[in-house]
Interface confidence: low
């Protein structure tokens, strides 16, 4: 139960990519404001986004403290201008979020091909190791730092003159593939955590093709 002029938040949804994590909810407030609390299963509640008229709250700073923990959030509704007011049960109206485990659930952001280098009939394709907001010893960790060998990349490559794609996988950020001499190739990569059951794959990177600026070519 709550006060007559407030409504409980609903559709609480976690939106998370590379650990940048925002809780969203409805409805847009009319004469009310929200405060969010977040907790691990065993921890204390911590308040964030105090008395906001937004319908989202950035909880990244909290979840990056331990991305393997499971988090729960709740959104409190208060009458605008009277945030001390409580419901008949002596507390403001609130709604719980689904549980969220960042390591298992954060979406993988679109990767970027950093470079490719041809040496004879071999091409080395390097994927940019994207920085996350997860910190260790005051430095930001890369996606690879966080996921280690749980993270792989799939490379799709094809001759510019045809549509038949080949694939390769790596659990580093580099591929070394064989190509036909004198042929130009195009490349796209996808980040994958195959051991996951949800949010296993990123969207494909932008396509990069040989003969464009990104590459470097050395014939032997």
């Amino acid at each position: 139960s709550g006060t007559t002029n407030t409504v409980a938040a609903y559709n609480l949804t976690w939106k998370s990519t590379n650990f940048k994590t925002i809780l969203e909810w409805e409805p847009k407030p009319v004469n009310q404001v929200y405060t969010v609390q977040i907790s691990t299963k065993s921890g204390d509640w911590k308040s964030k986004c105090f008395y906001t008229t937004d319908t989202e709250c950035d909880l990244t700073d909290e979840i990056v403290k331990d991305v393997k923990q499971t988090y729960l959030a709740r959104v409190f509704s208060y009458p605008a201008g009277n945030v001390e007011s409580t419901g008949s049960a002596g507390e403001p109206l609130y709604e719980n979020s689904p549980e969220f485990t960042p390591y298992l659930e954060t979406n993988l952001g679109q990767p970027t091909i950093q470079s490719f280098e041809q040496v004879g009939t071999k091409v080395n394709v390097t994927v940019e190791d994207e920085r996350t907001l997860v910190r260790r010893n005051n430095t930001f960790l890369s996606l690879r730092d966080v996921f280690g060998k749980d993270l792989i990349y799939t490379l799709y490559y094809w001759k510019s003159s045809s549509s038949g794609k080949k694939t390769a996988k790596t659990n580093t950020n580099e591929f070394l593939i064989d190509v036909d001499k004198g042929e130009n190739y195009c490349f796209s990569v996808q980040a994958v955590i195959p051991s996951r059951t949800v949010n296993r794959k990123s969207t494909d990177s932008p396509v990069e093709c040989m003969g464009q600026e990104k590459g470097e070519f050395r014939e032997i």
Partner: antibody
């Protein structure tokens, strides 16, 4: 430490069903696909199917699709494989196996021997 | 489904010598190949994945190579504890399929 502990050996009559369990520990059960592989005496390995413990969705080898059912119990971190209409050629060791990054099976149960005999 | 053909079925090698097993896929599986070791009365054990990557804790005498349809698994210097049956498996396309196995013995 990741462990997959399977139920004990079974002896069944032709036409009966058998249900083998696989209790997982040491990792997030819903975070990895669970697969079932069988091995007839003196034979090679044969993949039967896999289940997503998070959703219960499963994929089967067409050969077994009509007779095998994969289920999970998230509350006990246990996967189950039920094979119906048993025949003598189903006599085999049945393994559960956790699928790792990229697809290989990194952790295996100890195996459950199922003997089908009249 | 993809058929994996493994050869030879039996391989006898002297201690300290090289053992080589081949696996051929009926269609391209990229580098989606794993290799397993199975000792008598035991469950299979993952040795190699992505055709050439050693799994955690696997000694470096075990190696793999290949791409597309043709793959090779090598034990560079056979030890007594390597006596086992070895299987290739494609994890490129469901249904996941295994080779028929190669029994490695000491000559």
């Amino acid at each position: 430490e990741v462990q997959l502990v399977q139920s004990g050996a079974e002896v069944k009559k032709p036409g009966a069903s058998v249900k083998v369990s696989c209790k997982a520990s040491g990792y997030s059960f819903t975070g990895y696909y669970m697969n079932w592989v069988r091995q007839a005496p003196g034979q090679g390995l044969e993949w039967m199917g896999e289940i997503n413990p998070s959703t219960g969705g499963s994929t089967y080898n067409q050969k077994f699709k009509a007779r095998v059912t994969l289920t999970v119990d998230q509350s006990t971190n246990t996967a189950y494989m039920e094979l119906s209409s048993l025949r003598s050629e189903d006599t085999a060791v049945y393994y559960c196996a956790r699928r790792e990054l990229g697809g290989p099976f990194g952790y295996w149960g100890q195996g459950t021997t199922v003997t089908v005999s009249s | 489904s993809i058929v994996m053909t493994q050869s030879p079925k039996f391989l006898a090698v002297s201690l300290g010598e090289r053992a080589t097993i081949n696996c051929k896929a009926s269609q391209s599986v990229s580098n989606g190949i794993a290799w397993y070791q199975q000792k008598p009365g035991q469950s299979p054990k993952l040795l190699i994945y992505f055709a050439s990557n050693r799994y955690t804790g696997v000694p470096d005498r075990f190696s793999g190579s290949g791409y597309g349809t043709d793959f090779t698994f090598t034990i560079s210097s056979l030890q007594a504890e390597d006596v086992a049956v070895y299987y290739c498996q494609q994890d490129y396309s469901s249904p996941w399929t295994f080779g028929g196995g190669t029994k490695v013995e000491i000559k």
